[in-house]
């Protein structure tokens, strides 16, 4: 366990041209406050993922009123550090988001108004117990200067705050195999007591009483090898003899999420989805109201009407979640019609339309036949974003410009000979066959296999069928 500490040194216009206008004015005095969000690992995730390591808000800074005509100076800052307590090991690598908020103190109906002035983000490596690290980050025309460090809370020590220290039992030296706790030389490293029976070869612990397994091992005491053979249940059957994964305690067993948070397992650990009004890795930070600026990404905070809606964030387009912390995958709603490709550009949605379609959502079916003539009496038929010509007899090709050979497909059956004719084709049938395509055999007794003839027609009269 320990605390991440952030000290803001200055927030003001960055170097170079285009100094920003002061966020406050004589008509609209304001004051600043800051919000920090921490996530473990060198996460590429931006503001929309939860602050799994924790979040903190500064106090409000002094009220500031712009001097007319003066450029924006460094703005007055809140006193003190921003502190983010962490209960587990310090991950060593982390991502941060620092937001600078403005609280306007004019005569707004319904109290002060908050707006996001700047957001900076970064990914850093940091050992707990080390010195303050200094940083400068720019957001548009603004520049934020700050320092940060992670420190362990006694009795934890070490770069990850996982080693424990205890006062020396003997005045001269520490027990066998135990080192002095730098920088607390009068204390000794305490042996970390893992869960009883935890495999010394395949298990380890970062906190007393736990047993975490090295890769390839599983079970409550890390004594069961993980097999790649087929297992019966999602975490494998419980028989240790199979070598399958034993359903030992899952990260969500016993629900580590406080205050009604719901737990979901992640590949590395667990994640708590907190009810409105609660924050933190385990939803342990409570009592959040609009005064704490809980809405991310420029969300507008309004007071809720009951204890379960302590505050309500009205999210700007593209964000959702009770704190506007999730970026909306707007393409998942499949807004592009007619097979268009959806592109979420952050500030806007774009649809890349298939041929034959247009419009912001590819909703317009272009007139495929507009300006496309079919030659030689063919007619244009629209369909599926393309046009095609239905050609008159004797013509073919995309635009009916090619003269078709009606006999090319060998349409005359039973050895009949085909002749091209201005109206199409004519079949000269071989002896014993008749019909427009020589498809009917003529029987020797004069009867034929033709369907029953209409009244007034003799079944054996071939020329009627040419």
């Amino acid at each position: 366990a320990g605390v991440f500490e952030l000290q803001i040194h200055s927030f003001g216009p960055g170097p170079g041209p285009g100094a920003p206008r002061s966020p406050c004015s004589a008509r609209l005095p304001c004051r600043l406050f800051f919000r920090v969000c921490l996530k473990p690992g060198l996460s590429e995730e931006a503001a929309e993922s939860p602050c799994a390591l924790g979040a903190a808000l500064s106090a409000r800074g002094p009220v500031y009123t712009e001097q007319p005509g003066a450029p924006a100076p460094d703005l007055p800052l809140p006193d003190g550090l921003l502190q983010v307590p962490f209960r587990d090991a310090w991950p060593g690598t982390f991502s941060f988001i620092i937001e600078t908020w403005r609280e306007e103190l004019g005569d707004q109906i319904g109290g002060p108004a908050w707006s996001l002035l700047a957001r900076v983000a970064g990914r850093r490596r940091l050992a707990a117990g080390g010195p303050w690290a200094r940083d400068i980050q720019r957001a548009g025309a603004w520049e934020l200067r700050f320092s940060y460090r992670a420190r362990c809370e006694p009795p934890a020590v070490g770069t990850a705050c996982t080693r424990l220290c205890r006062p020396r039992s003997a005045p001269s030296r520490c027990g066998p195999g135990l080192r002095p706790c730098a920088p607390l030389e009068d204390e000794c490293e305490a042996p970390l007591v893992c869960r009883a029976g935890c495999s010394p070869e395949h298990g380890f612990c970062e906190q007393p009483g736990e047993c975490r397994c090295l890769e390839g091992w599983t079970g409550p005491l890390c004594t069961v090898p993980v097999s790649t053979s087929s297992c019966l249940s999602p975490r494998g059957p419980s028989s240790a003899t199979t070598g399958c994964l034993v359903p030992g305690p899952g990260p969500c067993d016993g629900n580590p999420c406080a205050n009604g948070g719901s737990c979901s397992e992640t590949p590395r650990s667990f994640e708590c989805t907190c009810p409105r009004g609660f924050y933190g890795l385990r939803c342990e930070v409570s009592g959040v109201t609009c005064a704490d600026g809980p809405c991310f990404n420029g969300g507008l905070c309004v007071g809720g009407a009951d204890p379960d809606s302590a505050y309500i964030c009205h999210c700007p387009p593209g964000f959702q979640g009770s704190n506007c912390e999730k970026r909306v995958d707007r393409c998942s709603l499949q807004p592009c019609r007619n097979g268009g490709l959806c592109l979420d550009l952050g500030h806007a949605l774009r649809c890349r339309c298939r041929a034959g379609f247009a419009g912001p959502r590819c909703e317009h079916d272009l007139d495929d036949c507009a300006g496309r003539a079919c030659a030689n009496g063919g007619t244009c038929v629209e369909g599926g974003g393309a046009h095609r010509c239905s050609c008159a007899l004797g013509f073919g090709g995309r635009d009916c410009r090619e003269r078709a050979d009606p006999c090319a497909a060998r349409p005359c059956a039973h050895g009949g000979r085909c002749y091209a004719h201005f109206s199409g084709l004519v079949c000269a049938c071989a002896p014993g066959y008749m019909g427009a395509r020589c498809e009917f055999p003529v029987h020797p007794d004069g009867a034929s296999a033709l369907p029953a003839a209409p009244p007034g027609l003799r079944p054996g009269d071939p020329q009627r069928y040419l």
Partner: antibody
């Protein structure tokens, strides 16, 4: 537009039972706590019961006047809120409203429960 | 159990500003009571006006505003209209229990 439609009211004898239902539409019912509020003829409003959402373990709360007689429940899959009323008394005669608090208060049109011998 | 007290009746004139208040027997009303204001018109027509102390519901005229004045919650109607004549209830949350005031009958003469 959020809609709350109460049904199930009617005339019942003292010590009898009745189950009220409230069908909810146009908002994510599962996310929010829900309430029943009543108004006796010519009287003010009285909060009756509250049920929180799943992430708060469907915790329930009751006014002292109905405790151990009324049971509030919900069916998230159907977006339905219920009030099971047992051992009814004449003073339970009232218009019953399904009420949802979020940024402000949303009301149904109410259903009338009359307890009379 | 907490008791919530409102003025039983108030009278105002069109165009005047009137303030209705809501007192808690347990001490000062705070934002943690999530004060709500509800308007009742004839035929059991209820409208939520204000939630969370000062959050005006959509469609509610801007002349209605909610606030905390001293140790009480307040509903102010700036420039009352004849159609504002109604009964106004305030509700305060005490953790997960809601207590209503007795209602204020507002007459706009």
């Amino acid at each position: 537009e959020v809609q709350l439609v109460e049904t199930g009211g009617g005339l019942v004898q003292p010590k009898g039972s009745l189950k009220l239902s409230c069908a909810v539409s146009a908002f994510t019912f599962t996310t929010y706590a829900m309430n029943w509020v009543r108004q006796a003829p010519g009287k003010g409003l009285e909060w009756v019961a509250r049920i929180r959402n799943k992430s708060n373990n469907y915790a329930t709360y009751y006014a002292d006047s109905v405790k151990d007689r009324f049971t509030i429940s919900r069916d998230d899959s159907q977006s339905m809120l219920y009030l099971q009323m047992n051992n009814l008394k004449i003073e339970d005669t009232a218009m019953y409203y399904c009420v949802f608090y979020y940024d402000y208060v949303y009301w149904g049109q109410g259903t009338l429960v009359t307890v009379s011998a | 159990q907490a008791v919530v007290t409102q003025e039983s009746a108030l009278t105002t004139s069109p165009g005047e500003t009137v303030t209705l208040t809501c007192r808690s027997s347990t001490g000062a009303v705070t934002t943690s009571n999530y004060a709500n204001w509800i308007q009742e018109k004839p035929d059991h027509l209820f409208t939520g006006l204000i939630g969370g102390t000062n959050n005006r519901a959509p469609g509610v005229p801007a002349r209605f505003s909610g606030s905390l004045i001293g140790d009480k919650a307040a509903l102010t109607i700036t420039g009352a209209q004849t159609e504002d004549e109604a009964i106004y209830f305030c509700g305060l949350w005490y953790h997960n229990h809601l207590v209503f005031g007795g209602g204020t009958k507002l007459t706009v003469l």
